[in-house]
Interface confidence: low
């Protein structure tokens, strides 16, 4: 999936299986990513688990779990708030669109999380105070905290190179980046560009991610995924000058 | 160098109206161990910082004064001055305790927010 880190780095990651997205003293978010097509290096998020840790007089430990075709508006224990403590309402789940869009407010840690199902896959967005982001017990053992450190270099796909290549040669795929033998070859570059431009008029990294996804999968739902990801940035990012990213830094994670 | 953050966390863990860790309790040692851990985490960026080196020596002195072992539990991390779980004196304040921005505004203007997102393939 495409990852925008807490430090505004933008990466396309081929991480497969279960990976920690956030892991601090208050919250743990794990995603499970699966290949979008057989033989493809590109992966998308098929499962999301969020653990809100027991916190003082505010909330009991709560676990939220979403999977493909199952976006519940409740924690796994059936509740919609933080439990029985005095400040239980400082953690709340709100269903915005049934089965498609859920918002979790964790006021006790100043955090808002948006989870969506777009097409078959899940998207995740969070707004969190720096103090909470950095509240980790052991920096050394939490080296794979994706939102903070980014993806390991060997798990990154250079989708801008893919984009440049595709621009020059139609829908020919970069095998090294993301071979997708079963993707519909009939999806031309021009169509991908048109579809993405429709939803994402600014040619930023969200637009480029959209084009990459369409060429890789032939699934137009990924246009909406990029569109909603940008909408969530507009709602959640505190710096309105940084809504659109144009350069992807591919430096070492950390 | 984030030594001032370590100092303030230790201060808030060992002082204040609910005093979770008075000098003669195991909690005080736990708070000291947390303080030591905090200084170790920030060590790389604090070389030559006077406040850092005095904190490190101060911790060693306090550890030996109070017979604290180096290994053992650390105090539970807290956000700002939020009290420890189960502190009954603070129960009536729970709506504010459980509202990060309200408790933050007591200390500084507004928290710095960050964003992370994951989408697509």
């Amino acid at each position: 999936p495409h990852l925008r880190t807490f430090t505004d780095r933008f990466q396309t990651c081929k991480v497969q299986g279960a990976w920690p997205l956030i892991d601090n003293n208050y919250l743990n978010v794990q995603v499970t990513n699966t290949p979008v097509l057989p033989g493809s290096a590109a992966t998308a998020t098929s499962k999301l688990t969020i653990i809100f840790k027991n916190f003082q007089e505010c909330v009991d430990q709560k676990v939220y779990q979403a999977e493909m075709d199952e976006l519940p508006a409740a924690f796994v224990d059936g509740s919609k708030n933080g439990g029985d403590k005095h400040g239980a309402n400082s953690l709340k789940i709100t269903e915005k669109v049934s089965g498609q869009h859920v918002e979790i407010q964790a006021k006790y840690i100043g955090t808002t999380i948006v989870v969506r199902q777009v097409g078959r896959y899940l998207t995740f967005a969070v707004r969190m105070p720096e103090e909470v982001v950095n509240a980790v017990e052991d920096w050394d053992s939490q080296g794979l905290y994706l939102c903070l450190r980014g993806c390991p270099l060997n798990q990154q796909i250079d989708f801008q190179a893919f984009h440049t290549n595709a621009e020059g040669t139609g829908a020919r795929r970069l095998a090294a980046a993301s071979p997708a033998p079963t993707a519909p070859e009939t999806f031309p570059y021009e169509t991908a560009v048109a579809k993405c431009k429709e939803k994402l008029p600014v040619e930023d990294l969200y637009y480029q991610a959209c084009v990459f996804d369409l060429l890789t999968t032939g699934d137009v739902n990924f246009t909406l995924a990029a569109y909603y990801a940008l909408e969530d940035v507009k709602m959640l990012h505190s710096n309105k000058d940084k809504l659109h990213l144009y350069e992807r830094t591919r430096d070492l994670p950390g | 160098c984030k030594i001032l953050k370590c100092n303030s966390e230790f201060w808030s863990a060992t002082s204040g109206s609910h005093a979770p860790a008075s000098d003669d309790t195991p909690e005080f040692c736990a708070a000291l161990r947390s303080y030591a851990l905090c200084t170790r985490r920030t060590a790389r960026t604090c070389r030559g910082d006077l406040a850092y080196h005095s904190a490190v020596h101060g911790i060693e002195d306090l550890m030996s004064q109070h017979n604290c072992s180096k290994d053992g539990p650390t105090s539970q991390p807290r956000l700002r001055t939020l009290p420890p779980a189960g502190d009954s004196q603070e129960r009536s304040d729970s709506p504010e305790i459980c509202h990060y921005e309200k408790s933050f505004h007591k200390h500084s203007a507004t928290p710095n927010y960050t964003h992370c997102g994951l989408f697509g393939d």
């Epitope: 991480v15 497969q16 299986g17 279960a18 990976w19 920690p20 892991d23 743990n28 794990q30 688990t49 653990i51 840790k53 027991n54 009991d60 430990q61 676990v63 779990q65 409740a74 796994v76 224990d77 059936g78 509740s79 439990g83 052991d138 053992s141 794979l144 | -």
Partner: antibody
Amino acid sequence: EVQLVQSGAEVKKPGASVKVSCKASGYTFTSHGISWVRQAPGQGLDWMGWISPYSGNTNYAQKLQGRVTMTTDTSTSTAYMELSSLRSEDTAVYYCARVGSGPYYYMDVWGQGTLVTVSS
Amino acid sequence: QSALTQPRSVSGSPGQSVTISCTGTSSSVGDSIYVSWYQQHPGKAPKLMLYDVTKRPSGVPDRFSGSKSGNTASLTISGLQAEDEADYYCKSYAGTDTLFGGGTKVTVL
């Protein structure tokens, strides 16, 4: 003290069912999952599945799907594991364990185990 | 789904260090932060020794430590003691099933 206390040993015939109970105390029963793990004589540990006592959500090991049923009774803080169509290879000690922080994570408290013998 | 692979047995003298490996796939070990280790004495229930690869529950001596490299997680017991003689199991999660390793018998010579 957090404790899980299991029911006593059982002897069953092949084809029968067995229901093992696990009574929790010392913590809020609905705030943790319960996993079931079995261990055949002289063998290793074998995960059977998980249940959320609050919602009844379950996640069973693929090889036991259709034969295992996990339930809970929140009024008595008790979890149950029922295994049907028993065969001799189901002879094992069955453990319940509290799950530390979510369905698939670490098991921090274990019951004492219940020996189930399947023999004709 | 195959279990995680552990050596059948390891041994060491008191005071020595021993390391038990637990090898799986990228999804069961390599990409997972949720690897835990359990100690089991004969006739007893297992006991949690490490969780989330490296973390020690309270009450577990600090001579027990965990690490991970690639698709292999490891448990190290430094300063081996007589009471450490037991079976040790690793556990992780892959796909939809929780997996245990086959177990390693640690013998204190």
